[in-house]
């Protein structure tokens, strides 16, 4: 029961043309060429975009048009390698352009940066925004999409293009307001964390298809959708398990058109078939194409069913469970991933991964044995650590997040994180400590029951940030080994990092440690930023600092920078105050 | 609407073959272990067999060689073929939903049953 | 296979009245135990599973207990329309499954 159209077109580009709409068209081709090739000029790209879609205009009207029956990657690749600084701008990737596809495709995925070096985004004043607003709409919003997409080259692009309706909504709104800067900026700070949080989810999707396979993603996706939707039968999870990975894959592999329009044609096929999936979904199937894909994504669970019998019975008492294991492996697991999940939407899903791990090796082993009824029978007692390591590492980080509060809390993980893996670049450390510490302020508030799902699943994203950024330069055998290994257990793989007793402590550099005036007018976040750098660093000199140590640092630092920011010659008093900070600092810690 | 209605009852003389339909509306098939359940007249309930989402058919031990269970998931259908049959075959036969793919029960989903009788 | 006897075979009572019906398994069974009401020309209804969870729909007078080998179900007050044959069905320790011989209630 696919619900993707099988027929075969004449031509791809048009096929995709007349079934996105012109406006789509160009917004997805824009996507795919920004993500492709981070550093080119906007000018540049929007040329391509133009001359792609003029291309499948011609093909419309007729399909049998020179060129028309290529493939899309086929005509995209070859507008991509028309850019005349190809080879002094992206050195290497120029090379993709003598192989043939799909090889062509799989190498400018391989060259897409996670980390590009491009300028920090800065937002201008609210009056310039809405002239540019005002003066070319069309142009205003393609740049949003073309800064956003060269910047997180994983962006799964129809959800783009929903970040886009609201971006450009809130300037219509807000343009017109009478207090323009306080209508707009709160909309553009949620449209900033809810893209950086997008972007992060998506980067673990195609990770997980990338690394780990298609098996590894459709697993992730049973246990998800069951949670979602307990009452919809196997059958149908299974089904629409299917057709998200065609999706994702699509999306994660560039194929942005195709991606686009089959997540379309699902959200078609969900809300078509809402009485048999979820009954949640009434208000999503009513909101228009966009708002509909992206509420289904984020639809709460539905209510477990009544009458849910004790798996034990399937799945550990009988005695044919070998049988029904070696005669339908992938239908038996799927099976008993889909019964576990539905019945445990308090448990995240990396962790029904992992127990649903433990039963399929338990099953390897104990269908081989003498008597593999007497191996299996306490096969759910192993379940009990699994379940409780996560639930007693939330609920301790719980508490320290209470106690210590958001920004000491990032704190304390910038340090516990430093110590595991000091040969992190800082940024890197700072970026992932700082998001990692979110976690606090987005899920201890929850109650139990949704404590789990939100924590752990929020921190195999975050994990996934540093594993992505890793992978461009490693540095750290231990996070290679932790990214690696297991997908579902990496956090209980940094969970379990002590201290890297072989790491040489970094020598000291005042540098690092001085400051000047401009802190003074840094947002409170990007002065929190700079404390916390300051606060890697130190712990890279001085791996085996005590906490009390590194507390009484940090509050000197702390009222040092209050101190000089009240000072009338400010700069005078960071250049004084400073020497006498680094040499008590280096007393304090021994250095 | 969620139910199961079986077909393909009926009288037949003894040493002859029937086979028993059991059509599902309102869900699919494939995700259920699908069983068949008999009551002679005046009598208890007998289980038959099932065959699991892994298309795997067990029988109780009286009726294996005799019964066969299979299904067709295009036509939503699962199917009881019988052979040799006897009268003391004589009996309603049911249509049962397993709890899930792999279960053996509870059976909360039933047919309304069809006849057969065997005699000469 | 297992074995399921049901006890009594018939059982006779009033309205109001508390009633009692046992199976007793012949191998332990864990708590994979149902029962069934079945009236007339109908196929069997679900009242109990896993021994003792009440089916949604199901009046709380239906209870149900044991594990292992002795389970019990019990009508707290007796209604009108519980005269019926019920049965207990065995399930989970193997790909086949038992029912109970049955058990008529009949209006004393």
């Known amino acids: 029961r696919g619900v993707f159209r099988r027929d075969a077109h004449k031509s791809e580009v048009a096929h995709r043309f007349k079934d996105l709409g012109e406006e789509n068209f160009k917004a997805l081709v824009l996507i795919a060429f920004a993500q492709y090739l981070q550093q080119c000029p906007f000018e540049d790209h929007v040329k391509l975009v133009n001359e792609v879609t003029e291309f499948a205009k011609t093909c419309v009207a007729d399909e049998s048009a020179e060129n028309c029956d290529k493939s899309l990657h086929t005509l995209f690749g070859d507008k991509l390698c028309t850019v005349a600084t190809l080879r002094e701008t992206y050195g290497e990737m120029a090379d993709c352009c003598a192989k043939q596809e799909p090889e062509r495709n799989e190498c400018f995925l391989q060259h897409k940066d996670d980390n590009p070096n491009l300028p920090r985004l800065v937002r201008p004043e609210v009056d310039v925004m809405c002239t540019a607003f005002h003066d070319n709409e069309e142009t205003f919003l393609k740049k949003y999409l073309y800064e956003i997409a060269r910047r997180h080259p994983y962006f799964y692009a129809p959800e783009l293009l929903f970040f886009a309706k609201r971006y450009k909504a809130a300037f219509t709104e807000c343009c017109q307001a009478a207090d323009k800067a306080a209508c707009l900026l709160p909309k553009l700070d949620e449209l900033r964390d809810e893209g950086k949080a997008s972007s992060a989810k998506q980067r673990l999707k195609c990770a997980s298809l990338q690394k780990f396979g298609e098996r590894a993603f459709k697993a992730w996706a049973v246990a998800r959708l069951s949670q979602r939707f307990p009452k919809a039968e196997f059958a149908e999870v299974s089904k629409l398990v299917t057709d998200l990975t065609k999706v994702h894959t699509e999306c994660c592999h560039g194929d942005l058109l195709e991606c686009a329009d089959d997540r379309a044609d699902l959200a078609k096929y969900i809300c078509e078939n809402q009485d048999s999936i979820s009954s949640k979904l009434k208000e999503c199937c009513e909101k228009p194409l966009l708002e509909k894909s992206h509420c289904i994504a984020e639809v709460e669970n539905d209510e477990m069913p009544a009458d849910l019998p004790s798996l034990a019975a399937d799945f550990v008492e009988s005695k044919d469970v070998c049988k029904n294991y070696a005669e339908a492996k992938d239908v038996f697991l799927g099976m008993f991933l889909y019964e576990y999940a539905r019945r445990h939407p308090d448990y995240s899903v990396v962790l029904l991964l992992r127990l649903a791990k433990t039963y399929e090796t338990t099953l390897e082993k104990c269908c081989a044995a003498a008597d593999p009824h007497e191996c299996y029978a306490k096969v759910f007692d192993e379940f009990k650590p699994l379940v409780e390591e996560p639930q007693n590492l939330i609920k301790q980080n719980c508490e320290l997040f209470e106690q210590l509060g958001e920004y000491k809390f990032q704190n304390a993980l910038l340090v516990r994180y430093t110590k595991k893996v000091p040969q992190v670049s800082t940024p890197t450390l700072v970026e992932v400590s700082r998001n990692l510490g979110k976690v606090g302020s987005k899920c201890c508030k929850h109650p139990e029951a949704k404590r789990m799902p939100c924590a752990e699943d929020y921190l195999s994203v975050v994990l996934n940030q540093l594993c992505v950024l890793h992978e461009k330069t490693p540095v750290s055998d231990r996070v290679t080994k932790c990214c690696t290994e297991s997908l579902v257990n990496r956090r209980p793989c940094f969970s379990a990092l002590e201290v890297d007793e072989t790491y040489v402590p970094k020598e000291f550099n005042a540098e690092t440690f001085t400051f000047h005036a401009d802190i003074c007018t840094l947002s409170e976040k990007e002065r929190q930023i700079k404390k916390q750098t300051a606060l890697v660093e130190l712990v890279k000199h001085k791996p085996k600092a005590t906490k009390e140590q590194l507390k009484a640092v940090m509050d000197d630092f702390a009222a040092f920078v209050e101190k000089c920011c009240k000072a009338d010659d400010k700069e005078t008093c960071f250049a004084e105050e400073g020497k006498k900070l680094v040499a008590a600092s280096q007393a304090a810690l021994g250095l | 609407e969620v139910q199961l209605v079986e077909s393909g009852g009926g009288r037949v003389q003894p040493g002859g073959s029937l086979r028993l339909s059991c059509a599902a509306s309102g869900f699919s098939l494939s995700s259920y272990a699908m069983n068949w359940v008999r009551q002679a007249p005046g009598k208890g309930l007998e289980w038959i067999g099932h065959i699991n989402a892994g298309d795997i058919a067990y029988y109780a031990t009286w009726a294996k060689g005799r019964f066969t269970i299979s299904r067709d998931n295009s036509k939503n259908t699962v199917y009881l073929q019988m052979n040799s049959l006897r009268a003391e075959d004589t009996a309603t036969y049911y249509c049962a939903r397993g709890a899930g793919g792999f279960s053996t029960g509870p059976f909360k989903l039933w047919g309304q049953g069809t006849q057969v009788t065997v005699s000469s | 296979a297992f074995e399921l006897t049901q006890s009594p075979s018939s059982l006779s009572a009033s309205v109001g009245d508390r009633v009692t019906i046992t199976c007793q398994a012949s191998?332990?069974?864990?708590?994979?135990l149902a029962w069934y009401q079945q009236k007339p020309g109908q196929p069997p209804k679900l009242l109990i599973y896993d021994a003792s969870d009440l089916t949604s729909g199901v009046p709380s007078r239906f209870s149900g207990s044991g594990s292992g080998t002795d389970f019990t179900l019990t009508i707290s007050s007796l209604q009108p329309e519980d005269f019926a044959t019920y049965y207990c069905?065995?399930?989970?320790?193997?790909?086949?499954?038992?029912f109970g011989g049955g058990t008529k209630l009949t209006v004393l």
């Open positions: 069905q065995g399930y989970g320790g193997s790909s086949t499954t038992t």
């Open positions: 191998e332990s069974i864990n708590s994979r």
